[in-house]
Amino acid sequence: SSPTSSASSFSSSAPFLASAVSAQPPLPDQCPALCECSEAARTVKCVNRNLTEVPTDLPAYVRNLFLTGNQLAVLPAGAFARRPPLAELAALNLSGSRLDEVRAGAFEHLPSLRQLDLSHNPLADLSPFAFSGSNASVSAPSPLVELILNHIVPPEDERQNRSFEGMVVAALLAGRALQGLRRLELASNHFLYLPRDVLAQLPSLRHLDLSNNSLVSLTYVSFRNLTHLESLHLEDNALKVLHNGTLAELQGLPHIRVFLDNNPWVCDCHMADMVTWLKETEVVQGKDRLTCAYPEKMRNRVLLELNSADLDCDPILPPSLQTS
């Protein structure tokens, strides 16, 4: 998802010039120390250089900026604000740069920013206004089209005393700034649940990746507002069954493909509707690979091969007959 450069001719800046240059106003199209630049490809790469802050002297032509594999720690307000502004910057990749805090307005003054990748950063503190830039109830629309937030969950001991899901969702919904977002990737974040209001406020979403989380149920999640959703990745979660309401909503989305591999499906009487739906629907990719995990007697049975007689629930014994 993140931008890759087609550049073949990169110029590296000489590190020994850095101190001399920083003492005077930056030249318009110079290449920052420890970076590689290609004006032809409009690309700057400052990769695996242990940078602790965003270079101040980024060339005005930059369209694709890679700041991956660094040690940025904090992204302050206006981290990319420059005079003149970086008006062309469209794709920004900050993955794997040890960011643990992204402050309000960190991406302000980037009028063309379409793609942002913050993956593989332990974001213990993601400001609610990181993407909207202000605490107004309705902010100026963000130009972001793709937001990649895979594996941004910090280690357990570094989390604030609040829900990680809630922190991320607050940033996604603040000021309704992300109404134009088309791709959202939230894979590998240990999400236990999906707050019910998040999808309703991202109506332009075409691609939603929630794979490799810990989602147990979608009962309270509504996909109805995502009228043009094209892909819903739910692989590698803890889903046990999809209920009728969810099945009907998914079936009502004419452009959707749903990815459900590697979930611990429970093949009891509650699975009957889902099995019927799977046999009829075209929206599930690789539906013939879905297998039961529980109960033990059903393990590895293919969902598509089940019939109603296979799907039973043990009767619940009255309390007087239960044994401890």
Partner: antibody
Framework: EVQLVQSGAEVKKPGATVKISCKVS????????MNWVQQAPGKGLEWIGR????????NYNGKFKGRVTITADTSTDTAYMELSSLRSEDTAVYFC????????WGQGTLVTVSS | DIQMTQSPSSLSASVGDRVTISCRAS??????LNWYQQKPGKTVKLLIY???RLHSGVPSRFSGSGSGTDYTFTISSLQPEDIATYFC?????????FGGGTKLEIK
Amino acid sequence: EVQLVQSGAEVKKPGATVKISCKVSGYAFSSSWMNWVQQAPGKGLEWIGRIYREDGHTNYNGKFKGRVTITADTSTDTAYMELSSLRSEDTAVYFCANGGAMDYWGQGTLVTVSS
Amino acid sequence: DIQMTQSPSSLSASVGDRVTISCRASQDISNYLNWYQQKPGKTVKLLIYYTSRLHSGVPSRFSGSGSGTDYTFTISSLQPEDIATYFCQQDNTLPWTFGGGTKLEIK
């Protein structure tokens, strides 16, 4: 912005097969769905079918089913539409259109079927 | 298949006029109704999707409304560059189907 560039005009004999290509660029924000649409001379638009490029899943209009095959090569960001057993009424401009709601269209490829 | 009936098939209007085109589906299409523009000899452009959502870069003089089976496309103030054929299309139920088109001319 997404741009779709189609292959050039073709002249075919009845009974032959034509294969049209459609290359996507500006792919960062392109859709996974690629549709194909027919426009016969002086006529309206008719949907032929679509492919979900990532997994190859296809849907076809029953009118063309059995004669049309839509494929995609993700390594080159190119989609293809092959129409076989051509007849004179297949003479038309064929468009590829990217997106569930067909957000962006190619420039069209004229296919002339004539003996 | 769902039939899409578009009217009128042609219309003539003056610059600055308000222009409306109708599209009726043979069954409920749940707002999955798109409008396209095709200028003579040119490719097709999406203007409006899901009944009323403006596609990126499309001028605000274009709008859409409707529900169920009946939908309307409006140009609030006709401009010379709007001379084109306009098509409606449903993408609720496969196969997708188009209206017959409305050819718009300037008086």
